[in-house]
């Protein structure tokens, strides 16, 4: 009886694992083995595919074959008993194009209200992704074990921290890799679960803000308790993108080590131009808080996002405010080459009731004022870019009296 050649050959490539699967064409024939040959582009001869010779099952692994993953190859298969079937040729393919990204390795660390996720490629020193290893980004799905309500987090790097979690709560997550340059989305990792710790005695500092005063940066934060000492550390933001790097070498800001106030001042020349991450930790001498959430700090924007300068033209029932470019030391105007939005706060001098106007324009009318009344105005600028959500400090307040009731010009 003639042996039929096998059919429906599937090539599965995950990372550096090359798997072939096929269907037997004749289930009734026993003791059949299968063998594969391969052919590289531009070659006439077929070569025996090591790892896939005289196979009794319908699956084989040819991962040991050292292929150029960017080069097209062709496969053929036949069945063998006493005689052999004809060859069945598989459509040619390029391994890299066919390859899927395997599940990444995930390692979790817990704090009371945060989880640190370390992610690394599932295959160490992968040949398939050798040229793309630095381009991996990851996304994850996280949920409380008790509720199952999922939250997705996209575009994260090899180490990511999730904040604002509940203490003593089990969270589960799964992670997958992507190579956006090659339009490849990977396979999810197994589900990993971790329980956050009991609530720490000391909470981390909150609401960290950086502003510029004279030639200094002023870093401020909020803290629940008094009589604490604080330390501040910085890190180059680009280091977060380095996939092989699990050691983030956070550095102390010398003027912000063991400070006893909820702010510290340090010279602008501490930082060269660039984007940094900052974090703050509190201590009462016996206990230490976990680190605060990291804030992004861009020296370019921070240095130049100075409070706006404005002139007021007073009328009887309104102010006309003309916003100009802020002045640097030396009285030269600063060129702001990104769109700004202005927040104007005004109040009656004798009252604490503040009113607010948000405007994109640089000429603003403050309406509904009382005649012959002193009003005070202060303003600050915000960047309109969500990613670089920065605000200047408020300008000094300027107080003016409205004109008598009959003037409207």
């Amino acid at each position: 009886k003639n042996l039929k050649s096998p059919q429906k050959v599937e090539v599965d490539i995950i990372d550096d694992n090359f798997i072939l699967r096929w269907n037997r064409s004749d289930e009734s024939v026993g003791n059949v083995t299968f063998s594969f040959d391969y052919q590289k582009t531009g070659m006439d001869n077929w070569i025996k595919l090591s790892g896939c010779q005289n196979i009794t099952s319908t699956k084989c692994n040819f991962s040991s074959l050292k292929l150029n993953v960017y080069e097209e190859i062709k496969l053929r298969i036949r069945a063998e008993k006493e005689n052999t079937s004809s060859w069945y040729e598989v459509d040619s393919f390029t391994p890299f194009r066919k390859a899927q990204i395997g599940p990444p390795e995930v390692h979790l660390e817990a704090e009371d209200k945060a989880i640190v996720i370390h992610i690394s490629p599932g295959t160490k020193d992968s040949v398939m992704w050798a040229l793309d290893g630095l381009s991996f980004t990851y996304s994850l799905v996280i949920w409380k074990n008790s509720s199952g309500v999922e939250e997705r987090i996209e575009n994260i790097y090899s180490r990511h921290k999730i904040y604002k979690l509940s203490p003593e709560t089990t969270y589960c997550l799964k992670v997958k890799a992507a190579l956006l340059t090659s339009w490849k989305i990977g396979v999810y990792s197994p589900v990993h679960c971790i329980k956050t710790t009991v609530e720490n005695e000391l909470p981390p500092p909150e609401n960290i803000e950086v502003s510029v005063q004279n030639q200094n940066y002023v870093l401020k934060w909020d803290y629940t308790y008094a009589n604490m000492t604080f330390q501040v550390q910085w890190l180059h933001a680009f280091l977060k993108r380095n996939p092989g790097n699990h050691l983030y070498k956070w550095k102390q800001i010398p003027d912000c080590e063991n400070v006893k106030t909820t702010q510290c001042v340090f010279p602008q020349n501490v930082f060269q131009k660039g984007i940094y991450l900052l974090r703050v930790q509190a201590s009462d001498g016996n206990n230490t808080s976990f680190w605060s959430e990291e804030i992004k700090f861009d020296t370019e924007i921070q240095a130049f996002l100075l409070p706006p300068v404005f002139n007021i033209r007073s009328l009887s029932d309104s102010f006309h405010i003309y916003i100009g470019a802020p002045k640097q030391s030396g009285n030269t105007p600063v060129i702001q080459d990104y769109p700004l939005i202005y927040e104007i706060i005004f109040w009656e001098n004798t009252s604490n009731a503040e009113r607010k106007i948000i405007e994109k324009k640089t000429d603003v009318t403050v309406p509904n004022l009382k005649p012959l009344t002193v009003y005070c105005v202060k303003a600050r600028a915000h960047t309109m870019d969500e990613k670089l959500n920065k605000s200047s400090v408020f300008s000094d307040a300027v107080c003016e009296k409205t004109k008598p009731g009959n003037t409207s010009k």
Partner: antibody, heavy 118, light 107 residues
């Protein structure tokens, strides 16, 4: 293969100083922190401090501030622990260890025995 | 400084038994705890990092658990090769600190 090779045993007189070395192979010390740990005979482990060989930044346990000085030389892939004003209390085995922020102290040197005796 | 307390200095067990070595931190250290095994005349051998992750090559008889302030190293199916001292260490805050050690003796 990753290894930390420490210098040999030292016998020194009280009041003197000693410098112990720890040379890394199979990795670049600049990419890690190198820590030093003290162990007295039949005792526990005491953390002395660490260095970031990339820029020389150090941290010390308060107890060893003034006693220990940690330095490094990236050209020879070596970290050093210098101990000054030695007393019998400094007689111990000193270990260096590598830290990568993920696996904690994943590789240790074989230890250097320091004996302070007149 | 954070104090790591291993209350049992010595523990006696038999081959095939299961034994738990405990370690208590004086304040919350998250899961930044490692465990080391040390045999006489040798340097400490890393067993566990991040509370529960085994280093490669460490038999799965060794498991770590806990979080916050209470941590445990469990050795199941104890072997005579496990006769050693075991140290916990916190690396959440400087100065890093070790427990005093627990010496495992085989009956």
């Amino acid at each position: 293969e990753v290894q930390l090779q420490q210098s040999g045993a030292e016998l020194v007189k009280p009041g003197a100083s000693v410098k112990v070395s720890c040379t890394g192979s199979g990795f670049n010390i600049k990419d890690y922190y190198i820590h030093w740990v003290k162990q007295r005979t039949e005792q526990g482990l005491e953390w002395i401090g660490r260095i970031d060989p990339e820029d020389g930044e150090t941290k010390y346990a308060p107890k060893f501030q003034g006693k220990a000085t940690i330095t490094s030389d990236t050209s020879s892939n070596t970290a050093y622990l210098q101990l000054s004003s030695l007393t019998s209390g400094d007689t111990a085995v000193y270990f260096c260890a590598r830290y990568d922020g993920y696996y904690c102290f994943d590789y240790w040197g074989q230890g250097t025995t320091l004996t302070v005796s007149s | 400084d954070i104090v790591m307390t291993q209350s049992q200095k010595f523990m006696s067990t038999s081959v095939g038994d299961r034994v738990s070595v405990t370690c208590k931190a004086s304040q919350n250290v998250g899961t930044n705890v490692a465990w080391y095994q040390q045999k006489p005349g040798q340097s400490p051998k890393p067993l566990i990092y991040s509370t529960s992750y085994r280093y490669s090559g460490v038999p799965d008889r060794f498991t770590g658990s806990g979080s916050g302030t209470d941590f445990t190293l469990t050795i199941s199916n104890v072997q005579s090769a496990d006769l050693a001292a075991y140290f916990c260490q916190q690396y959440n805050n400087y100065p890093y600190t070790f427990g005093g050690g627990t010496r495992l003796e085989i009956k």
